[in-house]
Interface confidence: low
């Protein structure tokens, strides 16, 4: 099967845009936007800090580690209330995501 | 205490190919982004390329042909493919922190020495 | 692609003086700025992420601000440990060609 040009396969995403948003302080922020075309029983998630196509299970129940959101060598953490997850570096940089 | 060292550096002649290794101490090569930077004699940092965990790798525009990035599990290597004289210089490798992907957040946190790259005839 | 104009190409202060550098990206780099230091036969070292976020073991002396395209490190109190060259670094990402990252052509610090 041909894929046309812009067309993704199956199960895979691209990165499509960094899109500008303010957050309550007004400071601007950075967002990063995927495209994904994902199949039967999964959702655009992230894994290895890149967008990807995960079990929507993860989704649903927020168990957010389960889809492997960190680099290799970083720790995943679940945010109180499951809102989303922290990916910690071996030198104590944390990353934190909240998913809205 | 994580470090890295660059291995390779030589005087060359011009069209011969080199390849640069990096090999990290301290933490694991394949769990992280790791960049390419060069600087010629008395000039200033030039970014070279990145490579991404899946061995997937980006460029600079004008190193795109020139370098080839690739890694095993214990190097993140730099092919110089056809060497000229104005590719003398040092060229540093360095661990990307943060995500790659989200432009604010890329910066390197650990460079290794450097290695020297003379090209000359 | 993304340019950085860093400025000034070199500078002279004393010991106490605050010290500015700037640099301006050709676009809207999100806060996708890091400033490094880097003394003679050595690598950089990062001194600031993220625009304004202060690395690890780095004196507070060392401050970085700015958002949009245009960027500033402030060395407030200059010390004599500080005279080396100072580089910036922006990152974007697009889909089209993936990460792109790009110095400012660096700033040398000379204190008197």
């Known amino acids: 099967q041909f894929l046309k040009e812009g067309q993704l396969a199956a199960g895979t995403c691209e990165i499509v845009t960094l899109d500008r948003c303010c957050n309550k302080n007004r400071r601007t922020i950075a967002r990063q936007t995927a495209r994904c075309a994902c199949r039967k029983g999964q959702i655009a998630g992230t894994t290895r800090a890149r967008p990807a196509c995960v079990d929507a299970r993860i989704i649903k129940t927020k168990q957010w580690c389960d889809m492997l959101p960190c680099l290799e060598g970083e720790g995943c953490d679940l945010l109180i209330n499951r809102s989303g997850w922290t990916c910690t570096q071996p030198g104590g940089r944390i990353k934190t995501t909240t998913v809205s | 205490q994580e470090q890295l060292v660059e291995s390779g550096g030589r005087l060359v002649t011009p069209g011969t190919p080199l390849t640069l290794s990096c090999t990290a101490s301290?933490?694991?090569?394949?769990?992280?982004?790791m960049s390419w930077v060069r600087q010629a004699p008395g000039k200033g940092l030039e970014w070279i390329g990145i490579?991404?965990?899946?061995?997937s790798t980006d460029y600079a525009s004008w190193a795109k042909g020139r370098f080839t990035i690739s890694k095993t599990s214990t190097t993140v290597d730099l092919k110089i493919t056809t060497p000229t004289t104005e590719d003398t210089a040092t060229y540093f490798c360095?661990?990307?922190?943060?995500?790659?992907?989200?432009?604010?957040?890329?910066?390197?946190?650990?460079w290794g020495p450097g290695t020297l790259v003379t090209v000359s005839l | 692609e993304l340019v950085m104009t860093q400025t000034p190409p070199s500078l002279s202060a004393s010991v106490g003086e605050t010290v500015r550098i700037r640099c301006l990206a050709s676009?809207?780099?999100?806060?996708?700025i890091s400033w490094y230091q880097q003394k003679p036969g050595k690598p950089p070292t990062l001194l600031i992420y993220?625009?304004?976020n202060l690395e690890s073991g780095v004196p507070p002396r060392f401050s970085g601000s700015g958002s949009g395209s245009d960027y500033t490190l402030t060395i407030g109190g200059v010390q004599a440990e500080d005279a080396a060259t100072y580089y910036c670094?922006?990152?974007?990402?697009?889909?089209?060609?993936?990460?792109?990252?790009?110095f400012g052509a660096g700033t040398n610090v000379e204190i008197k």
């Open positions: 360095a661990r990307v922190a943060g995500y790659v992907g989200y432009g604010y957040e890329t910066f390197f946190d650990i």
């Open positions: 676009e809207d780099i999100y806060s996708g």
């Open positions: 490579i991404y965990p899946s061995g």
């Open positions: 670094l922006g990152g974007v990402t697009y889909s089209s060609t993936g990460t792109h990252l790009t």
């Open positions: 301290g933490f694991f090569l394949s769990g992280y982004y």
């Open positions: 993220g625009a304004s």
